[in-house]
C-alpha cells in the first residue's frame, strides 16, 4: 500500500505505531491479574496454614463463587464462543464483590489487592467491547452484594482467612479457564 503523505515508510509497519490488538490486550490483562493473585496468595499462605487446610467445605457454604461448567461453552468439548464470553463477563462481575471483600485483608500487599480489583474492572470493559450479546449478561444486584459483603466481614477470623484463601484460589482457576477459552476465540 502507498505510504500516506508525511509518513515514513519504515514507520508504517513499526509495531510501536500499532497498539496491541484487543485479543493481545485481554490476554495480557488476564495474565497481569493472575500475577497479582499469585503475590496475594503468597502472603495468605505465609500468614496462615489455610493453603494446606482440609476444612474448606465449612467456609465454602457461605460462598457462591463463580465456576466454569460444561454448559458454559468454555471447555474444548462443546466450545461456544458467544456463550463462553457471556459466562466470563458474568463471572467476573460476580467476582467483584469478593474482590471488594479482599480489600483491607492484606497487610503488606494492600496495594496489590487494589491493583487486582482495578485491573479486573478494566478487563471487564475490554471483554464487554468484544461481546456482541450484552443483553445476555446479568449484572449482580447491588443490594444483594452489599448484604453479602456485610455477612462475610462479620465472620470470625478463621473463616475470614479461609474465605480469603478460597476467593483467591477460585478467582485464579476462573481466570485460567477464561484465558484458555479466550485463546481459542
Amino acid at each position: 500500500a502507498p505510504v500516506p503523505p508525511g509518513e515514513d515508510s519504515k514507520d508504517v509497519a513499526a509495531p510501536h505505531r500499532q497498539p496491541l490488538t484487543s485479543s493481545e490486550r485481554i490476554d495480557k490483562q488476564i495474565r497481569y491479574i493472575l500475577d497479582g493473585i499469585s503475590a496475594l496468595r503468597k502472603e495468605t499462605c505465609n500468614k496462615s496454614n489455610m493453603c494446606e487446610s482440609s476444612k474448606e467445605a465449612l467456609a465454602e457454604n457461605n460462598l457462591n463463587l463463580p465456576k466454569m461448567a460444561e454448559k458454559d461453552g468454555c471447555f474444548q468439548s462443546g466450545f461456544n464462543e458467544e456463550t463462553c464470553l457471556v459466562k466470563i463477563i458474568t463471572g467476573l462481575l460476580e467476582f467483584e464483590v469478593y474482590l471488594e471483600y479482599l480489600q483491607n485483608r492484606f497487610e503488606s500487599s494492600e496495594e496489590q489487592a487494589r491493583a487486582v480489583q482495578m485491573s479486573t474492572k478494566v478487563l471487564i470493559q475490554f471483554l464487554q467491547k468484544k461481546a456482541k450479546n450484552l443483553d445476555a449478561i446479568t449484572t449482580p444486584d447491588p443490594t444483594t452484594n452489599a448484604s453479602l459483603l456485610t455477612k462475610l466481614q462479620a465472620q470470625n477470623q478463621w473463616l475470614q482467612d479461609m474465605t480469603t484463601h478460597l476467593i483467591l484460589r477460585s478467582f485464579k482457576e476462573f481466570l485460567q479457564s477464561s484465558l484458555r477459552a479466550l485463546r481459542q476465540m
Epitope: L20, K28, Q29, D35, G36, S38, A39, S119, V122
Partner: nanobody, 116 residues
Framework: QVQLVESAGGLVQPGGSLRLSCAAS????????MGWYRQAPGKRRELVAD???????EYADSVKGRFTISRDNAKNTVYLQMNSLKPEDTAVYYC??????????WGQGTQVTVSS
C-alpha cells in the same frame, strides 16, 4: 513523557548469544508488565517474552529454553538474554510496557541479525 530505550542489537553468528536491555522512564516501572516483541520483514509482530510485576513470565514457543526475560525494578530495566540464536530469530526487537489500566508504550526497536 514515557521513554523506553533499547540497547543496540547487532550481528550474531548462529548458536551465539546476545543480551538486550531496555531502560524505562516516565512510568511506574514496578507496576508495569514489561516485554519484548519482534517483527521480521514481511511477518506479523509477535510476542517474544514478557514479565509481570511479580515475576510471572510468558515466552513464545519458538524461544522457550533459549531466551530468558528478567527485570530489575531498582534500575527500571528489563533484559532479554538470548542464547542459541538461530537465523529465524532475525528481526527488529521492540521493548514494550503495559500498565494495569491497559495503556501501553513501545521502544523504537533494535535490529538483531543472526547470520554466518
Amino acid at each position: 513523557q514515557v521513554q523506553l530505550v533499547e540497547s543496540a542489537g547487532g550481528l550474531v553468528q548462529p548458536g551465539g548469544s546476545l543480551r538486550l536491555s531496555c531502560a524505562a522512564s516516565g512510568i511506574i516501572f514496578s507496576i508495569n508488565a514489561m516485554g519484548w516483541y519482534r517483527q521480521a520483514p514481511g511477518k506479523r509482530r509477535e510476542l517474544v517474552a514478557d514479565i509481570m510485576p511479580y515475576g510471572s513470565t510468558e515466552y513464545a514457543d519458538s524461544v522457550k529454553g533459549r531466551f530468558t526475560i528478567s527485570r530489575d525494578n531498582a534500575k527500571n530495566t528489563v533484559y532479554l538474554q538470548m542464547n542459541s540464536l538461530k537465523p529465524e530469530d532475525t528481526a527488529v526487537y521492540y521493548c514494550h510496557s503495559y500498565d494495569p489500566r491497559g495503556d501501553d508504550y513501545w521502544g523504537q526497536g533494535t535490529q538483531v541479525t543472526v547470520s554466518s
